[in-house]
Every structure is written in structure tokens, then in C-alpha cells.
């Protein structure tokens, strides 16, 4: 009978046992265990009937299709085997083990005792069949093994071979190289590889095989296992293997597919191209006169670009456009892009206007083109080129016009300062009262009127200004200071205040220039109480035209002794101390108590010491500061009272032959005007020069040596 | 025509504020000063202080300068005078003056506990 | 703070005869810059704002009759009423405004 057992181990023993076996009995067990396994037997015990080729009593160990061994006996001789120590091993999860006794026993047997079980089978150790075995790394565990694969390969679908994801390889590059996976080592085995060149429309791909070539084939069919495929629209180049690389392949496409399939099995190193754009070409390019074309190549292709430049002075002209470059393409049907431009001269064409200056041209027919040269200058004798610039400026290469120092930035024209069209008087004896000013004399000269419209009725007064530039009047604090009913010190707004220059008659006006103020600023300083910093300026709406009536007067250096004592100033004004004259009568009146026509004295300036004793004799609160100075005479006299409030006090610079503002009529008295021993006061304008040119917004260095030359 | 128009009679305790209004008409409201003076029943007059609309700027009398406040809403031509902590004595009649020429007619004001 | 003295307290005046009136200031109201005296003269009539009537001590201000006539300078000045009329009646103040402005304090005027 036979008895099936599934167990992973388990005892087999003789019938009876440990008793003797009966005779004439044939019993079979059917081991069974699970895939993965295989099944050990050992005997612990084994006495059966000895008989030549174990002819009468035996055990017999098999698998479905393999006697394995046959026991009996009692010990092993030539013609009979007893199992002993040995154990049997099963090939696979199966075996059968049949015991048979004959029918007569000469003696009695104790029959056989005998244990089996189920062992791992380590397939990893064991699978010699290529076919079966794992592609890269065979993990083993009990009852089965899996495979796995290196870094950038995939386990295929059959659980064994190792492929690659390689069928999404795009190449848009004009040149390129392709390989099979792993190149040179031995490509993976059932895969499907998929390389894809785009190159743009008008390109055509040529493809040439490198190095080694070794796809697995067959000698008989042509490639079956492993290949290479080129399509090339509908057409199929291929399929290619074995050794031997295709000839270079011109493709007459700018679109290629490769198709490379491996199958599971095999070891070759596979293959490498290098693939290049052919492209059309385009006719050989002359360059333009005065010009050049990079790169200068013997054959231009498809998509090769050219750079159309011009020698220095020239600009490259293109459809009435002119540009420092030009580029053209070389297109896919072999023409190009673009006629090569021509080069022209550089024009820098008319140059900018310089206010207040002039332009001549230095090369003939006024040319503007490359090298040629213009020359500013100011219009003298009322302004003057700034640093002593030269004024030379050559058309560059880069169409503008260029001063070695300036660069492209024109020269500036600077008022002249401190120079009138009429010769001033240098030694007029003292005038009681003041004289007629010629027109031109003090061209520096501003009527300054203010009309506070805040209050009502509207509040007026002038004063007098000195003129500094096309654009600054310099006057004293107090004549734009706000007359608030505190003692805050507040300008006046700037819509409230009208500048007159050029004037000479007060009742005509007509040759006057009039501007309103931008900005009026006040030294921040300002004492309302002592006058101390009496300084001020006023921005004009626009730049006042120069001329022979209107100029400018120089400010002093900077030094805070001031003018000399002794020294002799001009004080010009319109004499203008009646206080019932409104500021009406004073701009459209002929009225007598004032002087219709400009007036000046010449005073001396006082020791320090000895206008500091004179107003401290005095009864009441004076203070003359180190920022003022004094002017006049001891025995008194008119004159010292003729400047209008903010007028310049000028001296003659002998070292610049130039008139300098060094003061401002600021205060004087309170005895009457012109009394014995009142000096007039007035602002030190050499301790102020700094904030001057700050206001203004020039560095000092800029203008000084207008009075210093 | 040119005028100034104030807002009407006030009775305030003692402690409390007091906001006079003054609508100008007929001139550039913005352009001109607009000045605060009282006048207490059967005295004189006393300046307060006085505004420039258009910028703002502000001048006190010293008396007042810790308890008057004026302020201008351009939008309105409107002066404003806000008096505070208030006491008998500030009992009077307070007029708008546009910079010295054009007088409100006044707002009475009674500071009574 | 300049103090502003007016005199007299009140004054009787006959209809058509001169009324005169003084104003004494504690410093004087002459600005050197604009050249002009800040002394204004306001007339108030019984229960009505003041009226301008004289600004920068002698301007008579547009409307005022011309029997207003204002003089003086530095620090002493006078409102004159040349012919005094019934309308007249009415309590004259001066008013410094050189610096932050103070008022005198008044002169009524009346009829004999």
C-alpha cells in the first residue's frame, strides 16, 4: 500500500518494527514538501534480509523519475548497501521510498527506522543554467531565492534578467554620440532602447559607428536575439549586430529614430555613434568696404551666423538704420538672411547749443563726420568757459562729439564776474550825498521788492541785491525775512518777492529785467535782534540773460579779517529812505524825495575797534560782531546812508582786477542818517562764502579763481 | 461780497472747551491771515492770535498761547478757534479779524458753573 | 509786550467841532525794513464789531470820510475827528501791530 506524507519531516519505519517485518509485504511513502525545499532522509536503524543485489528484502529511495538508492542487509559489501551514516538527498521537493520483503525469511529482521525533513535548496549556489539563473544578484532565503539589479537597471517581467528604461533619449544638438547602455561593458539584456535626434528643419543627420561594434547574433538568420534598427521617416535601415559597424549612414533627414532590443541572454559590449548636422550651403560673403565679417570661414552652412562690423569711425547702415553690428544667418535653403550692410562714416551730426556760447567749425564745409573738430567758446566779454576749458571737440568713433577732460558733457559757460561794461571810477573824491551811476556801472545792481500779500492792506518794501550768477541775487537776511509780529525768522514767500535787474531809472523800466524767485533762502543763523548773519539769497525763476546792464559782481575769498581798514567801497542804491514813500511810487513814480536814477558813494572802511566803540556809546542794545564790518566817515554826511538795505558794498581786487562784494548794507544809527560818527553797518561777506556757493550748489573750487585771476 | 461769518452764541461750565467758527467769502480764503480777538462785557479788546490758512503758520499771544488753538479747514473757508479750560473770566465776545481790515460779527461766549 | 496808552478815558465833543485823541506806544512802531509805522485806529459803535478806519499811523482806509485824518510817528500819535457828526458817537481804539499787536484801551467818544 502506499501511504502520502506532507509533512516537512517526519519517521518512516519498517512494518512491525521494532519487531520483525512480516513477509511478502510492500509498503511505499510519498514525501512531499513545498517548491524551494528538498527532503533529507537518514536511517537510525536498518536490518533487512542480505541478498545479492539486494534481490529479496530492500528499500528502495526515488523521485518521480530517478532511483536514488537501494538498501539492505546488514552491513555494506561489494553487491549490497546498507545506508549507514549516509543520508539521501532529494533533487526536488519529491520522494518516494517503497520497502519490500519476499516471501520467506530465513531468520528474523528487525526491519529499519528511518527520519526525513525538508532542507532549503540554495538556488543562488546551485543554478547552473544561464537560463534560469539570476542576471546581476541572486538573494536566497528559505524556501525560495529573488533577484535584483544594479543601480540604473530594472528586474524584467520574468523575474530573472536585468534591463534599462532607455526609450525616451531625445538629442537636439547639431552634434552628438550615442551608446548602447553601460558602453563598453556588455549592454543589459531584455531591453528596448529608443534614441530620438531633432534637429531643426533644414539640418540633415549624419550618423557614423565608432570603436567597437558587438551585437550578439546567429550565424544562420539574421540577427534574431539582439539588433539595431535606424528609421528614418517610414524607411528601416537594419536590422544591424554581429562585429562589423555599418557603413556611415547619411540620413537625408533632420529627424532619426534608433531602435536597439536586446533579448535575455548573451554578453556583448554593444555599440557607439557619433551623429553630426549636415546643413545647406550658402554663397561665400564679401565684406563691405570699411567693414569686416566674423567669422572668415572658406564655407558657410546652415545656421552659421555672421557679425557684420565696421572699422573704427564707421557704423554699419542697414535700411537707413545705423548700428554698430549687423548679424546674418545662412537659412535652410542656402541663401542669406540678409544683403550685407554697408558701412558708413560716423556723423555726430550738429553739435549741441551751448548757452550762452558760441560754435565754429575747424574743418572745412562744416563737416560733423569721424575727426571732425568743433571749438565752443562763451560770449565774451560776459561769460567764460569754466577750468579754462579749451572748448576742443572731436567727433569719436562713437558718433558724439568728445572733450579730452569733459568727455560728452558740454563746457559750461560761466558769468564773468565783477567786470562792468563801463570802467568804474577807482579814485572818485567823497561825494556828499552820492553821485549819478552811469548805466553799467554797478550792473550787479537789484532792486529787490517784496509784497506780502497776507496782510491787508498788503504789505511793501524793497531792498537791493547783489547779483552773483545768471541765477543768485546775494542780499542781506532782514530784507526777505517775513515781517511776522513775532520775532521768529521765517523768508518770505517766495511768490512775494519781483527782482528787477538792469535798472538804472526807477521810472523806466523798460530796459529792466524782471524775474520771481524760485527759493529764498535765509542764513539759518539770522539774529533779528542784533542782525548778526544779515545774509540771504534768492534763486530766480529763470536764468537772467548777461549783457552790457546785467553782470554779476565776485565773491571774495574766504577770510575772515574782511576788507582792510581805510579800504575804499562803492555803495550803490536809489537812495530810497522816505518813509511815506510806498513801494507804488518807488517802482512807477517820479516822486522827488528819492532818487529816480541809481546813485553811488565811495567810503572807507572803519577799524573794527573804533565803529565797536562808536555804537556802544550809544544808548540802547547795538552789537557789531566779528561778521560785520563798518564804512563811512567821523564827521558823517549823506552818504552814509544812500545803499538800500541788501546792497553790495564792492571793492576793487587788484590781484583779479575784478569787483568784489565784501559787504551787505545792513543797519545803521538811530541817530538821523548821515549824523556825526554813524557809521554804516554792514554784513562781512568773506565769512559767508562757503555757505554761498553751498546754496548755489557749486564747489567753491569751481568759481574762485574768477576773482583770483 | 467780502465777509466773515461766525457760528453762535456759547454757555459753557467752567473746565470745559469752546470751538468758534469763522466762514470766510468773497476772497482767497488760503492767501490772507485770520486773527482772534475778544472783548469782555464793557471792556476792551485783546488780541488772542492769529492764522495763516494756507500754510498753517500760527502766532499767540503769550496769555493764550497754553489754552488757544487755531486750525483751518481750506475745503470750507473755515476759521476755527478752540478755547479750553475755560473760566469765568473768559466770558466775552470773540471775533474773527481778516488781517486787520474785515471784522465777524462775534460769537458771545458764557462761561457760567 | 509793547504797552499802548490811550488818552483820555472819554471825551465830549460838540457837533462839528475837532475831536483829538491820543495814543502813546512803549517803543517805537517804525519797521526799518518795510519803512512803515504799524498804528492802526478802530472805530465801535455801540453793540457792532469794530471798523478800520486808519492804518500805518495816517492811511485812511477806502470809505472812511476824510474828517477821519490819523498822525504821529515813532512812538506818539493822535486820531484827529476835524467835524465832529452824530455818527460819530463811539468808543476809538488804537492797535500796535509791529510786533504780536496790543490795543489801547479805548477813548469814548460823546457829544456835549
Known amino acids: 500500500h502506499t501511504v502520502e506524507l506532507n509533512n516537512m519531516f517526519g519517521q518512516i519505519q519498517s512494518p512491525g518494527y521494532p519487531d520483525s517485518y512480516p513477509s511478502d509485504s510492500e509498503v511505499t511513502w510519498n514525501i512531499t514538501v513545498p517548491d524551494g525545499f528538498r527532503i533529507k532522509l537518514y536511517f537510525m536503524h536498518f536490518n533487512l534480509e542480505s541478498s545479492y543485489l539486494c534481490e529479496y528484502d530492500y528499500v528502495k529511495v526515488e523521485t518521480e523519475d530517478q532511483v536514488l538508492a537501494t538498501f539492505c542487509g546488514r552491513e555494506t559489501t561489494d553487491t549490497e548497501q546498507t545506508p549507514g551514516q549516509e543520508v539521501v538527498l532529494s533533487p526536488g521537493s519529491f520522494m518516494s521510498i517503497t520497502f519490500r520483503s519476499d516471501f520467506s525469511n530465513e531468520e528474523r529482521f528487525t526491519g529499519f527506522d528511518a527520519h526525513y525533513m525538508a532542507v532549503d535548496v540554495d538556488e543562488c549556489k546551485e543554478r547552473e543554467d544561464e537560463e534560469l539563473s539570476c542576471d546581476h544578484y541572486c538573494h536566497n532565503y528559505i524556501g525560495g531565492y529573488y533577484c535584483s539589479c544594479r543601480f540604473g537597471y530594472i528586474l524584467h517581467t520574468d523575474n530573472r534578467t536585468c534591463r534599462v528604461e532607455c526609450s525616451d533619449n531625445l538629442f537636439t544638438q547639431r552634434t552628438g554620440v550615442i551608446t548602447s547602455p553601460d558602453f563598453p561593458n556588455p549592454y543589459p539584456k531584455s531591453s528596448e532602447c529608443l534614441y530620438t535626434i531633432e534637429l531643426e528643419e533644414g539640418f540633415m543627420v549624419n550618423l557614423q559607428f565608432e570603436d567597437i561594434f558587438d551585437i550578439e547574433d546567429h550565424p544562420e538568420v539574421p540577427c534574431p536575439y539582439d539588433y539595431i534598427k535606424i528609421k528614418v521617416g517610414p524607411k528601416v535601415l537594419g536590422p544591424f549586430c554581429g562585429e562589423k559597424a555599418p557603413e556611415p549612414i547619411s540620413t537625408q533627414s533632420h529627424s532619426v529614430l534608433i531602435l536597439f532590443h536586446s533579448d535575455n541572454s548573451g554578453e556583448n559590449r554593444g555599440w557607439r555613434l557619433s551623429y553630426r548636422a549636415a546643413g545647406n550651403e550658402c554663397p561665400e560673403l564679401q565684406p563691405p568696404v570699411h567693414g569686416k565679417i566674423e567669422p572668415s570661414q572658406a564655407k558657410y552652412f546652415f545656421k552659421d551666423q555672421v557679425l557684420v562690423s565696421c572699422d573704427t569711425g564707421y557704423k554699419v547702415l542697414k535700411d537707413n538704420v545705423e548700428m554698430d553690428t549687423f548679424q546674418i544667418e545662412c537659412l535652410k535653403d542656402g541663401t542669406w538672411s540678409n544683403k550685407i550692410p554697408t558701412c558708413k562714416i560716423v556723423d555726430c551730426r550738429a553739435p549741441g547749443e551751448l548757452e550762452h556760447g558760441l560754435i565754429t567749425f575747424s574743418t572745412r564745409n562744416n563737416l560733423t563726420t569721424y575727426k571732425s573738430e568743433i571749438k565752443y567758446s562763451c560770449q565774451e566779454p560776459y561769460y567764460k568757459m569754466l577750468n579754462n576749458n579749451t572748448g576742443i571737440y572731436t567727433c569719436s568713433a562713437q558718433g558724439v562729439w568728445m572733450n579730452k577732460v569733459l568727455g560728452r558733457s558740454l563746457p559750461t559757460c560761466l558769468p564773468e564776474c565783477g567786470q562792468p561794461s563801463r570802467s568804474l571810477p577807482s579814485l572818485v573824491k567823497r561825494i556828499i550825498g552820492g553821485r549819478n551811476a552811469e548805466p553799467g556801472l554797478f550792473p550787479w545792481q537789484a532792486l529787490i521788492v517784496v509784497e506780502d500779500t497776507s496782510r491787508v492792506p498788503n504789505d511793501k518794501w524793497f531792498g537791493s541785491g547783489a547779483l552773483l550768477s545768471a541765477s543768485w541775487i546775494l542780499t542781506a537776511a532782514h530784507v526777505l525775512r517775513s515781517q511776522r509780529r513775532d520775532t521768529t525768522v521765517i523768508p518770505v514767500s517766495k511768490e512775494h518777492v519781483t527782482v528787477y535787474l538792469g535798472l538804472h531809472d526807477v521810472r523806466d523800466k523798460s530796459g529792466a529785467v524782471n524775474s520771481s524767485a524760485a527759493r529764498v533762502v535765509l542764513h539759518p543763523d539770522f539774529n533779528i535782534q542784533n542782525y548778526n548773519h544779515d545774509i540771504a539769497l534768492v534763486q530766480l525763476q529763470e536764468p537772467v540773460p548777461l549783457g552790457p546792464h546785467v553782470m554779476p559782481v565776485c565773491l571774495p575769498r574766504l577770510e575772515p579779517e574782511g576788507p582792510a581798514p581805510h579800504m575804499l567801497g562803492l555803495v550803490a542804491g536809489w537812495g530810497i529812505s522816505n518813509p511815506n514813500v510806498t513801494v507804488d511810487e518807488i517802482i512807477s513814480s517820479g516822486t522827488r524825495t528819492l532818487s529816480d536814477v541809481l546813485q553811488y558813494v565811495k567810503l572807507p572802511v572803519v577799524p573794527h575797534a573804533e565803529c565797536k566803540t562808536s555804537y556802544e556809546s550809544r544808548s540802547g542794545n547795538y552789537s557789531v560782531t566779528e561778521n560785520m564790518f563798518c564804512a563811512g566817515y567821523y564827521e558823517g554826511g549823506k552818504d552814509t546812508c544812500l545803499g538800500d538795505s541788501g546792497g553790495a558794498f564792492v571793492i576793487f581786487d587788484d590781484l583779479s582786477q575784478r569787483w568784489v562784494v565784501q559787504g551787505l548794507v545792513s543797519w545803521g544809527g538811530p541817530e538821523e542818517c548821515g549824523s556825526k560818527q554813524v557809521y554804516g553797518v554792514y554784513t562781512k561777506v568773506s565769512n559767508y562764502v562757503d555757505w554761498v556757493w553751498e546754496q548755489m550748489g557749486l564747489p567753491q573750487s569751481v568759481v574762485e579763481p574768477q576773482v583770483e585771476r | 461780497q467780502v465777509q466773515l461769518v461766525q457760528s453762535g452764541a456759547e454757555v459753557k461750565k467752567p473746565g470745559a472747551s469752546v470751538k468758534v467758527s469763522c466762514k470766510a467769502s468773497?476772497?482767497?480764503?488760503?492767501?490772507?491771515?485770520i486773527e482772534w480777538v475778544r472783548q469782555a462785557p464793557g471792556q476792551g479788546l485783546e488780541w488772542i492770535g492769529e492764522?495763516?490758512?494756507?500754510?498753517?503758520?500760527?502766532d499767540y499771544n503769550e496769555r493764550f498761547k497754553d489754552r488757544a488753538t487755531f486750525t483751518a479747514d481750506t475745503s470750507t473757508s473755515t476759521a476755527y478757534m478752540e478755547l479750553s479750560s475755560l473760566r469765568s473770566e473768559d466770558t466775552a465776545v470773540y471775533y474773527c479779524?481778516?488781517?486787520?481790515?474785515?471784522w465777524g460779527q462775534g460769537t458771545l461766549v458764557t462761561v457760567s458753573s | 509786550d509793547i504797552v499802548m496808552t490811550q488818552s483820555p478815558d472819554s471825551l465830549a465833543v460838540s457837533l462839528g467841532e475837532r475831536a483829538t485823541i491820543n495814543c502813546k506806544s512803549s517803543?517805537?512802531?517804525?519797521?526799518?525794513?518795510?519803512?512803515?509805522?504799524?498804528l492802526a485806529w478802530y472805530q465801535q459803535k455801540p453793540g457792532q464789531s469794530p471798523k478800520l478806519l486808519i492804518y500805518?499811523?495816517?492811511t485812511r482806509e477806502s470809505g472812511v470820510p476824510d474828517r477821519f485824518s490819523g498822525s504821529g510817528s515813532g512812538t506818539d500819535f493822535t486820531l484827529t475827528i476835524s467835524s465832529l457828526q452824530a455818527e460819530d458817537v463811539a468808543v476809538y481804539y488804537c492797535?500796535?501791530?509791529?510786533?504780536?499787536?496790543?490795543f489801547g484801551g479805548g477813548t469814548k467818544v460823546e457829544i456835549k
Open positions: 492797535k500796535q501791530s509791529y510786533t504780536l499787536p496790543t
Open positions: 479779524v481778516r488781517s486787520e481790515d474785515l
Open positions: 517803543q517805537s512802531l517804525l519797521n526799518s525794513v518795510t519803512r512803515k509805522t504799524y
Open positions: 492764522i495763516l490758512p494756507g500754510s498753517g503758520s500760527t
Open positions: 468773497g476772497y482767497t480764503f488760503t492767501g490772507k491771515w
Open positions: 500805518w499811523a495816517s
